[in-house]
Interface confidence: medium
């Protein structure tokens, strides 16, 4: 879920990201291994780079709560929201939210994390729902096997008209 | 820079009213539920009262409620807190707070504003 | 309501120690602990919270650990400026609870 309308844009290219707390049934050096990955989808066919902090503020902020936590978007307890994320141009730009009482993975049990942290992060990058079923973007879960999954070419356009493509590394 | 500014307090007599204002300045404030939080003299911290973004609902703890009216205008950036029926026990220093998005914790205070309630 | 219990309730300590409070939740609340230093006349500042999340600005030798129902806060090398009061707070469930205190004096 994006929480604030408009088209928007982060006006840097380097992001900073911080992953604040864990929820109960990953171990966190999973969760970061997921958060990564996220981001990366994202660097891999744009000009961003993201680089993890530890302490003190970040960009993107990814945290996990339960029920209300202050934000005037609660959750509801398993199934039903897994996240929300707040635009670019919010008065909360990069909060990215995950409900605590998902049974979040690695895998194909529960929740994959991933999964649903690339679509939170779009929001983030600035990125509504998408129509498209085989978008990321897509407002309903889906689950793609993470080895192999790859964004839809909407993703990928959309993503681009926010930031430009990837700048090539070949010189000739 | 990130403010929040109370006004208000003073010596008031039981059975009295006073009206607490707190101004925010620096961040999105029609965002944030608000908080007023107090703190008798020489004791600990005590939640008041909480109110949503939007202003529909209002929390209250059990020592103040039919008393206290929490309210805000977004467009003031002003939280407010109306006491009435006020009590000796209500003698306090008032907190405004808001709760952080990524931290769900009182990230900002107001300087708090005192509110003496005697004869 | 959840009661937050804080021990101990004041301390004597000289620059440089380590300096360890804890507190009790009446019942599990996950990392939903935060812990703020307030000083004489001043409102409280947050240090820690999600029980071990270092606040930005805050120093380093402020940590915070603990799940469930017990935590902790430490200070590595206590300094003239961390001589206050903290406080442990709980964001489980609402309303929200503080501990009632604990007060570091110099020795």
């Known amino acids: 879920t994006s929480i604030s309308p408009g088209r928007c844009k982060w006006n840097k290219h380097t992001l900073t990201y911080r992953i604040i707390n864990y929820p109960h049934d990953m171990k966190p050096s999973a969760v970061k291994d997921s958060i990564y990955n996220a981001v990366s989808i994202w660097s891999n066919v744009t000009p961003l780079i993201f680089q993890q902090v530890q302490n003190g503020d970040a960009d993107i902020k990814v945290s996990f709560w339960q029920w209300a936590h202050e934000d005037g978007w609660p959750f509801d307890g398993p199934g039903g929201i897994l996240g929300h994320a707040f635009l670019p141009n919010s008065g909360n730009p990069g909060v990215v939210h995950f409900d605590k009482n998902e049974h979040w993975s690695a895998s194909d049990t529960g929740y994959n994390l991933f999964l649903v942290a690339t679509h939170e992060i779009g929001h983030s990058l600035g990125l509504q729902h998408s129509g498209n079923q085989s978008s990321i973007m897509y407002p309903t879960y889906w689950y793609h096997d993470p080895r192999t999954f790859q964004l839809s070419a909407d993703d990928i356009q959309r993503i681009q008209h926010l930031y430009g493509e990837k700048c090539s590394s070949d010189i000739p | 820079e990130v403010q929040l500014l109370e006004s208000g307090g003073g010596l008031v007599q039981p059975g009295g009213s006073l009206r607490l204002s707190c101004a925010a300045s620096g961040f999105t404030f029609s965002f944030y539920a608000m908080w007023w939080v107090r703190q008798a003299p020489g004791k600990g911290l005590e939640w008041v009262s909480?109110?949503?973004?939007?202003?529909?609902?209002?929390w209250y703890a059990d020592s103040v409620k039919g008393r206290f009216t929490i309210s805000r205008d977004n467009s003031k950036n002003t939280l407010y807190l109306q006491m009435n029926s006020l009590r000796a026990e209500d003698t306090a220093v008032y907190y405004c707070?808001?709760?952080?998005?990524?931290?769900?914790?009182?990230?900002?205070w107001g300087q708090g504003t005192m509110v003496t309630v005697s004869s | 309501d959840i009661q937050m219990t804080q021990s101990p309730s004041s301390l004597s300590a000289s620059v440089g120690d380590r300096v360890t409070i804890t507190c009790r939740a009446s019942q599990s609340i996950s990392d939903y602990l935060n812990w703020y230093q307030q000083k004489p006349g001043k409102a409280p500042d947050l240090l820690i919270y999600?029980?071990?999340s270092l606040q930005s600005g805050v120093p380093s030798r402020f940590s915070g650990s603990g799940s469930g129902t017990d935590f902790t806060l430490t200070v590595s090398s206590l300094q003239p400026e961390d001589f206050a009061t903290y406080f442990c707070q709980q964001s489980y469930s609402i309303p929200l609870t503080f501990g009632g205190g604990t007060k570091v004096e110099i020795t």
């Open positions: 999600a029980a071990s």
């Open positions: 707070a808001r709760v952080g998005m990524s931290t769900y914790a009182f990230d900002i």
């Open positions: 909480r109110i949503y973004s939007s202003g529909g609902k209002t």
